[in-house]
């Protein structure tokens, strides 16, 4: 299992909607005894490790899991729409969060976390991260722009 981020930087004018995406590459575990816990959170660029500090996004804590017995479980605690958020996971491994009507306070480092659970044991914690920069309307573009990562930044962080 591997987590990649198609884009490492999103630059958006205030008021726009933006979809941040992580891609879960799960070639090894398909059909095996593996389940996944997934979440999005805000973090900061720590001195040692990115994505170590967790802060809720717009005071919302997302909980999602793919459980073999209950593959469709989406366990977010309340409707993310209340917070102007949408969280989605598709069959291609795209795990995304959409922020509606972004404001300057939405700027920050966004992390997706995927925990692979095998035989009830959390085997690995994999992170993807990206930066969102929200700019004031004056002189900024009218739509969001996404920038791909540098080669050295494209792989996910893994913490056993």
């Amino acid at each position: 299992i591997k987590v990649t981020t198609p884009y490492s930087l999103y630059v958006c004018p205030e008021g726009q909607n933006v979809t941040l995406t992580c891609r879960i590459l799960d070639s090894v575990s398909k059909g095996h005894d593996a389940n996944f816990l997934k979440t999005w959170f805000l973090s900061s660029r720590g001195e040692v490790q990115v994505c170590k500090e967790h802060r809720p996004i717009r005071n919302f804590i997302s909980h999602h899991q793919h459980h073999r017995s209950h593959p469709a479980v989406n366990a977010s605690h309340d409707q993310p729409q209340k917070h102007g958020l949408e969280i989605a996971y598709d069959n291609h491994g795209n795990f995304s969060i959409t922020l509606h009507n972004v404001t300057l306070s939405d700027s920050g480092l966004y992390c997706c976390l995927v925990i692979e659970v095998k035989h009830h044991h959390p085997e690995r914690r994999l992170y993807g991260y990206m930066e969102l920069q929200v700019q004031t309307g004056k002189g900024s573009a009218s739509t969001c722009t996404a920038y791909p990562p540098n080669e050295q930044d494209s792989d996910s962080i893994t913490a056993a």
């Epitope: 816990l37 979440t39 170590k52």
Partner: antibody, heavy 119, light 107 residues
């Protein structure tokens, strides 16, 4: 293995400040995890008081926020609870516990210490 | 804050029987965690993230549910399962909240 041990006075007078310390062995409190205080009363059951993270940031239960301070002493690998203006309602067994950031459950607990508020 | 209501408050069953403990949330939660507490001891983690057994927990313990309704099942009771069982959520935060507990007697 990781162990947590609470210490502090078992009797506190009303209106005084309750002070407890949790000593952690087998793991550095600056490495990871959130370090929590939880109390248990026969009437209210288990109640989360608050936590301090590995980086030193704190979060408190809104119902107690005005009276609670959680701090740490990294040189001693300890974190502490102060609860001011105590009343008989604060009589409880106080426990410290460790929780990983995600999926947010308490995997290691201290044995707990009973604090009685009485004059 | 999210209120967790556990039922039944007490449950008395015989060894070998199946126990079903309920935890109902006042609004939809993410994961529910379950703990076991015996007299004079600290709570012990049992099930995390709704489904997964914590380290050292036997397979007779299982968790299920989503949204507002979650269940802890003990498939074949042993005398040592006598304890109080608590559920906990960290979805609405702060505060983290616990259920009021279910006292299980196996005799």
């Amino acid at each position: 293995q990781v162990q947590l041990q609470e210490s502090g006075p078992g009797l506190v007078k009303p209106s005084d400040t309750l002070s407890l310390t949790c000593t952690v062995s087998g793991y550095s409190i600056t490495s990871d995890y959130t370090w929590n205080w939880i109390r248990q009363t026969p009437g209210k059951g288990l109640e989360w008081i608050g936590h301090i993270t590995y980086s030193g940031s704190v979060s408190y239960n809104p119902s107690l926020r005005s009276r609670v301070t959680i701090s740490r002493d990294t040189s001693k690998n300890q974190f502490s609870l102060k609860l001011s203006s105590v009343t008989a309602a604060d009589t409880a067994t106080y426990s410290c516990a460790r929780a990983l950031y995600y999926p947010w459950y308490f995997d290691v607990w201290g044995t707990g210490t009973t604090v009685t508020v009485s004059s | 804050e999210i209120v967790l209501t556990q039922s039944p408050a007490t449950l008395s069953l015989s060894p070998g029987e199946r126990a079903t403990l309920s935890c109902r949330a006042s609004s939809s939660v993410g994961y529910i965690h379950w703990y076991q507490q015996k007299p004079g001891q600290a709570p012990r983690p049992l099930i995390y993230a709704t489904y997964y057994r914590a380290t050292g927990i036997p397979a007779r313990f299982s968790g299920s549910g989503s949204g507002t309704d979650n269940t802890l099942t003990i498939s074949s009771l042993e005398p040592e399962d006598s304890a109080v069982y608590y559920c906990q959520q960290w979805s609405s935060y702060p505060p983290i909240t616990f259920g009021g507990g279910t006292k299980l007697e196996v005799k």
